[in-house]
């Protein structure tokens, strides 16, 4: 298992919500990506392929997510101060072998300007 801070901008704020970007190498074909808040699994997305190369995408803990060829974005809405925490992208690589797990993360700071419904 490889642990480290994300070497890219992991948090993108918009409209009172945040997009949490979890990147993976282009070469990875099949994987599970989990978004952890502290030690708790908030969201996950699994991409696998069958023997006919058909892609299956599953979520056991569903969040609004978006898949590209080198990242999974998880979206959290209605931000408040309780969202401030360490968030980790837990990547399990199934393909190509060997099986590998990597953990990258960062701290989500919540500022008044990013909250969805500020009191005037």
């Amino acid at each position: 298992e490889i642990n480290g801070s994300a070497n890219y901008e992991m948090f993108i704020f918009h409209n009172g919500g945040v997009q949490i970007l979890c990147k993976y190498p282009d070469i990875v074909q099949q994987f599970k990506m989990q978004l952890l808040k502290g030690g708790q699994i908030l969201c996950d997305l699994t991409k696998t392929k069958g023997s006919g190369n058909t892609v299956s995408i599953k979520s056991l803990k569903f969040c609004h997510s978006q898949l590209s060829n080198n990242s999974v974005s998880f979206f959290l809405y209605n931000l408040d101060h309780s969202h401030a925490n360490y968030y980790f992208c837990n990547l399990s690589i199934f393909d190509p072998p060997p099986f590998k797990v990597t953990l990258t993360g960062g701290y989500l700071h919540i500022y008044e300007s990013q909250l969805c419904c500020q009191l005037k």
Epitope: I27, Q29, Q30, T46, T48, S51, N53, S56, D95, P97
Partner: antibody, heavy 117, light 111 residues
Framework: EVQLVESGGGLVKPGGSLKLSCAAS????????MDWVRQAPGKGLEWVGN????????EYSPFVKGRFTISRDNVKNILYLQMNSVKSEDTATYYC??????????WGQGTLVTVSS | DIVMTQSPSSLAVSPGDRVTINCKSS??????????LTWYQQKTGQAPKLLIF???TRHTGVPDRFMGSGSGTDFTLTINSFQTEDLGDYYC?????????FGPGTKLELR
């Protein structure tokens, strides 16, 4: 240790039906696509079809499409092959296989299906 | 559908021989960085066993005398120093698209 054990084979008349089962153990069944592969006596291997982890996707060989149905029970860890309208050319040993992400990495011992009147 | 062909269909071999089995696909099996080509061994009365995946990667526990090579549409399984326990049928297989198909097989027999 991964184990796949097929059952349900036997003699069936042309046009008849048969349901094969494959009991899986030694791995997290619900994490894997599963396939059926068959082998006619003295012949080569032929893919029958597959099913994804939760049963929402199935694919079939053109030779069996519309006649065979693959399903799974992730609570009991069992893979099924429902064979309807069978033909003599369906006579074969049927193998249950685990699709280990990039190859069939585990196979059952096979169960023989004979279609004959 | 992709058609897989193999040559020879059978081969008489002796212990210590270098054995070469060829497999040809009707279209390229290259997807991204990998060739979606697999080799299986089947001994008489047994289920097939995985030998090589992604054209050249040996499966866990497969002796290093088994080697896979090739690219595009042409692939080779080589057994360096054939042993009697290697007798059986060998199949290539693609998973480039649906339906995945097997080659017709190559039977290794004792000379």
């Amino acid at each position: 240790e991964v184990q796949l054990v097929e059952s349900g084979g036997g003699l069936v008349k042309p046009g008849g039906s048969l349901k094969l089962s494959c009991a899986a153990s030694g791995f997290t069944f619900s994490d894997y696509w599963m396939d059926w592969v068959r082998q006619a006596p003295g012949k080569g291997l032929e893919w029958v079809g597959n099913i994804d982890e939760d049963g929402s996707i199935t694919e079939y060989s053109p030779f069996v499409k519309g006649r065979f149905t693959i399903s799974r029970d992730n609570v009991k860890n069992i893979l099924y092959l429902q064979m309807n309208s069978v033909k003599s050319e369906d006579t074969a040993t049927y193998y249950c296989t685990r699709w280990g992400r990039f190859a069939f990495d585990s196979w059952g011992q096979g169960t023989l299906v004979t279609v004959s009147s | 559908d992709i058609v897989m062909t193999q040559s020879p269909s059978s081969l008489a071999v002796s212990p210590g021989d270098r054995v070469t089995i060829n497999c040809k696909s009707s279209q390229s099996l290259l997807s991204g960085s990998f060739h979606y080509l697999t080799w299986y061994q089947q001994k008489t009365g047994q289920a097939p066993k995985l030998l090589i995946f992604y054209a050249s990667t040996r499966h866990t526990g497969v002796p290093d005398r088994f080697m896979g090579s090739g690219s595009g549409t042409d692939f080779t399984l080589t057994i360096n120093s054939f042993q009697t326990e290697d007798l059986g049928d060998y199949y290539c297989h693609h998973h480039y698209n649906a339906p995945p198909t097997f080659g017709p097989g190559t039977k290794l027999e004792l000379r």
